[in-house]
């Protein structure tokens, strides 16, 4: 099956302090190799969570990624502040036998719009 | 069909300001994530501002931050820009325009509303 | 943010000819690209949305293509209704959303 991967939402709007669900699903989990989490786009990127087990603080994956072909890669940030706003990427990579792994395909990103918390 | 119909354009001074609007028909306007996009005599098109179907979510480009002020009524099915100081650089044909449901490319477009800022 | 460059910025050809605009992008946008007509007095149109596929009642006529940084319009008989300026947009790195500056077809 070709790969696809969807992130359904284009945007989520979060009260400050509130959590919120990114979704991400792949359509197959061929090529094998890592799925990653991303703010921003370029060089000036930044890795939220990688689903290869490395601890990532107030970020969780939303289901049991390690299940035989789980094909959901939603993550949950908690304690959600103004500085996670931004645009956020689900990112499949393909593993290299030596050299780095290699970004093969991207969801369409979900903008994380944050509000002030209600007072 | 779908419609959009941009009004109240003219020409005012620098410094002065001035409120478009946009009438949408043929879709449910409060589902859609709608903006604005300008294009300056013999330029291309810019991005100027964008707001989600609850009217919760709403971005600007850097070039309009803090003197336009896009917002919607969707009891009204309309679309408005609120343009403040506005500067000589403003003078453009301002269109509005229907996202896509899924992504943030623009299935429809209004005629335009010309803008002219002149001393 | 990515900024998106059109080539050529003016095409001089007869009805009846094939040609390809190109748009490139500062940094991979995948296939999140679409590609709009204007015509003076007109609306712009949507063509192509996912770098390939054609909008609802485009014909075939006009082609898409490209992945990454580097993506293509074609149109492969120009018809006199196809004289206009052609833009691309990126819509991957947001917000801004960014077009390219443009092409534009004209009659020889």
């Known amino acids: 099956k070709e790969l696809k991967v969807t992130q359904p939402e284009k945007s989520v709007s979060v009260a400050a302090g509130d959590s919120t669900v990114l979704n991400c699903t792949l359509t197959s989990l061929l090529p094998v190799g890592p799925i990653k989490w991303y703010r921003g786009v370029g060089q000036s990127r930044l890795l939220i969570y990688s689903f290869t087990g490395e601890h990532f603080p107030r970020v969780t994956n939303v289901s049991d990624a390690t299940k035989r072909n789980n094909m959901d890669f939603s993550i949950r940030i908690s304690n959600v502040t103004p500085e996670d706003a931004g645009t956020y990427y689900c990112v499949k990579f393909q593993k290299g036998p030596s050299e780095p792994d290699t970004e093969i395909q991207s969801g369409g990103g979900t903008e994380v719009y944050v509000l002030a918390k209600p007072s | 069909d779908v419609q959009l119909v941009e009004s109240g354009g003219g020409v005012v001074r620098p410094g002065e300001s001035l409120r478009l609007s946009c009438a949408a028909s043929?879709?449910?306007?409060?589902?859609?994530?709608m903006n604005w996009v300008r294009q300056a005599p013999g330029e291309g098109l810019e991005w100027v501002s964008l707001?989600?179907?609850?009217?919760?979510?709403?971005y600007y480009a850097d070039s309009v931050k803090g003197r336009f002020t896009i917002s919607r009524d969707n009891s009204k099915n309309t679309l408005y820009l609120q343009m403040n100081s506005l500067r000589a650089e403003d003078t453009a044909v301002y269109y509005c325009?229907?996202?896509?449901?899924?992504?943030?490319?623009?299935?429809?477009w209004g005629l335009g509303a010309l803008v002219t800022v002149s001393s | 943010e990515t900024v998106l460059t059109q080539s050529p910025g003016t095409l001089t050809l007869s009805p009846g000819e094939r040609t390809t605009l190109t748009c490139r992008a500062s940094?991979?946008?995948?296939?999140?690209l679409a590609w709009y007509q204007e015509k003076p007095g007109q609306a712009p149109r949507l063509l192509i949305y996912?770098?390939?596929s054609r909008a609802t009642g485009i014909p075939d006529r006009f082609s898409g293509s490209g992945s990454g940084t580097e993506f293509t319009l074609t149109i492969s008989s120009l018809q006199s209704e196809d004289f206009a300026v052609y833009y691309c947009?990126?819509?991957?790195?947001?917000?801004?959303?960014?077009f390219g500056g443009g092409t534009k077809v004209e009659i020889k």
């Open positions: 707001i989600s179907g609850s009217g919760e979510i709403i």
């Open positions: 043929g879709f449910t306007f409060s589902s859609y994530d």
């Open positions: 325009a229907k996202e896509d449901n899924r992504y943030r490319f623009f299935d429809y």
């Open positions: 947009q990126q819509y991957y790195d947001r917000p801004p959303l960014t």
């Open positions: 996912g770098a390939s």
């Open positions: 940094q991979s946008v995948y296939t999140y």
